[in-house]
Amino acid sequence: AITEAREEAKPYPLFPGPFPGSLQTDHTPLLSLPHASGYQPALMFSPTQPGRPHTGNVAIPQVTSVESKPLPPLAFKHTVGHIILSEHKGVKFNCSISVPNIYQDTTISWWKDGKELLGAHHAITQFYPDDEVTAIIASFSITSVQRSDNGSYICKMKINNEEIVSDPIYIEVQGLPHFTKQPESMNVTRNTAFNLTCQAVGPPEPVNIFWVQNSSRVNEQPEKSPSVLTVPGLTEMAVFSCEAHNDKGLTVSKGVQINIKAIPSPPTEVSIRNSTAHSILISWVPGFDGYSPFRNCSIQVKEADPLSNGSVMIFNTSALPHLYQIKQLQALANYSIGVSCMNEIGWSAVSPWILASTTEGAPSVAPLNVTVFLNESSDNVDIRWMKPPTKQQDGELVGYRISHVWQSAGISKELLEEVGQNGSRARISVQVHNATCTVRIAAVTRGGVGPFSDPVKIFIPAHGWVDYAPSSTPAPGNADPVLII
């Protein structure tokens, strides 16, 4: 928001006047002509001295009268050369020319800075015919001038394919200073110098600048526009504005807040979006960024088990999208999780810690020492194993899944058995004789089925063969054990 003082406020005598030899007024200038109103021109300057030849374009008509007297050259009459007035005032100026009556359809057009003025402009042309000539007065009026009305105005008339151009009328609209550049809000590093810029223009010129910081003037004497203020550094937020002064008064820029960059506030509302056996998806609401964009965040995870060694796992991630999946966690474990984020100044404090738990997972290892042997008397295959280590069960064991595949003469059949968690042995009926039985076992929790053990193969002979020895899980390196009985 720009505050404007009254025009009359002139705190500094800046310069004597905008143009050498020119006058100034706040009255509406009106050009008086013989057929116009009785007002005297309040502020008008003729570009030529009396008696000096006209400088505009002149058309010399070739037509002669009955007495064969050549007609005088056609030219616009001298008029005001320069009008100075205040913004929002009214102005009226005109061009006049006397045209012999032999010419028909004479029209006058108005031009500003080389462009024809068409449409919604207050231009009036009046004709005053006499015996031999018609006086034409073209008036142009602006009811409330703005800065955009500044410029050079001319009249043009076409006669006999000749163009007659008047001398220019310069309109100068004066007002309070107008900002072309105002200070901008900034976020700055504490105790570090920075610059602010302020620029304002008239007319009238010159425009002088005062800087204000937290209601105190920084410079007690004005500086010519444009002005750059070097602020030597701040320790706390400050508000800056600049005042632009000219002969018409002063305009005050918007006040801008300069903030001091600081470490961010800690994130809030850390919450669990999803838990699996080995990962937890968390989200958080970032704290205040300290007037400096977040760069990245750090997720700190520690086991909540009082018997744990208290070590903290740290996961770094980008600041967006305020979401992170923590991986490589143990199943069925409790964790404390905190989040901290950083900007260019430093790290925030850690968010309030939250408790989170991983779910049961499928065991991560297979049962150990799987042994298979044939009990020929009962026509069964006996299987034995050792349960996987508790740490790697990833949940409460609910049983085992046994896969046994029977292969004989191009026929293959897989069967699955489920057994309870108490035992560590199972018995399965022989399905096919003179065949190979391949056995694999997996531990089962509510979280799912773990990996199957390496396959153990046993050959089941035709009836009457003897079971000499068991088959067992191979030692590492023997990929495909087979025991022929």
């Epitope: 800087w211 920084v218 007690e220 004497q221 203020l229 070097t230 030597p232």
Partner: antibody, heavy 118, light 106 residues
Framework: QIQLVQSGSELKKPGASVKVSCKAS????????MNWVKQAPGQGLKWMGW????????TYADDFKGRFVFSLDTSVSTAYLQISSLKAEDTAVYFC???????????WGQGTLVTVSS | EIVLTQSPDFQSVTPKEKVTITCRAS?????MHWYQQKPDQSPKPWIK???NLASGVPSRFSGSGSGTDFTLTINSLEAEDAATYYC?????????FGQGTKLEIK
């Protein structure tokens, strides 16, 4: 380079007047205000006020209203301090100093000792 | 008006020692300037706007502070630092100076 050169020491009787000058060089005189600072013997610095070298408008600190006048002659880039009805407690060194942004006194005159003694 | 109180008024210090001069304002100010004055000389601009060393001031000097409490620190005192130091506030008229702190070399 910027310099402020002050007039020489003055010995005055009580009730008399004195005018101290401060001639500036090396910069545009009307760009920076001129401050006046008093330092009584063995005492600290006391700001007396300043004069706007652009408009000639003086501003006086409360303790220096009345007998003290700041003036200018911009044609010779000189600021003046005039003290009338001198008193013994006016005995001091008077400094002129330029008025920069944030009231930073970047340049100082060498000081003028005014002694008031009967 | 804002009253500036410097402490100590006087300090006798051995070379290489660290020196801290404080300037406390009776109410909050935006910036504090510091000046150094030696006997029979005019004050010299020393630290501008709380923490900016003036041209030619040795880097062993530093300034800090905000609000009402400001300090001038000399990290390792040298003989040439013997002088009186004045603080001066900007932010509220009239401008005021502290009463000065005189540093003497032992």
């Amino acid at each position: 380079q910027i310099q402020l050169v002050q007039s020489g020491s003055e010995l005055k009787k009580p009730g008399a007047s004195v005018k101290v000058s401060c001639k500036a060089s090396g910069y545009t005189f009307t760009n920076y205000g001129m401050n006046w600072v008093k330092q009584a013997p063995g005492q600290g610095l006391k700001w007396m006020g300043w004069i706007n070298t652009y408009t000639g408008e003086p501003t006086y600190a409360d303790d220096f209203k009345g007998r003290f006048v700041f003036s200018l002659d911009t044609s010779v880039s000189t600021a003046y301090l005039q003290i009338s009805s001198l008193k013994a407690e006016d005995t001091a060194v008077y400094f002129c100093a330029t008025y920069g942004h944030y009231a930073w006194f970047a340049y100082w005159g060498q000081g003028t000792l005014v002694t008031v003694s009967s | 008006e804002i009253v500036l109180t410097q402490s100590p008024d006087f300090q006798s210090v051995t070379p290489k020692e660290k020196v801290t001069i404080t300037c406390r304002a009776s109410s909050s100010v935006s910036y504090m300037h510091w000046y150094q004055q030696k006997p029979d000389q005019s004050p010299k601009p020393w630290i501008k706007a709380t923490s900016n060393l003036a041209s030619g001031v040795p880097s062993r000097f530093s300034g800090s502070g905000s609000g009402t409490d400001f300090t001038l620190t000399i990290n390792s005192l040298e003989a040439e630092d013997a002088a009186t130091y004045y603080c001066q506030q900007w932010g509220t008229k009239p401008l005021t100076f502290g009463q000065g702190t005189k540093l003497e070399i032992k």
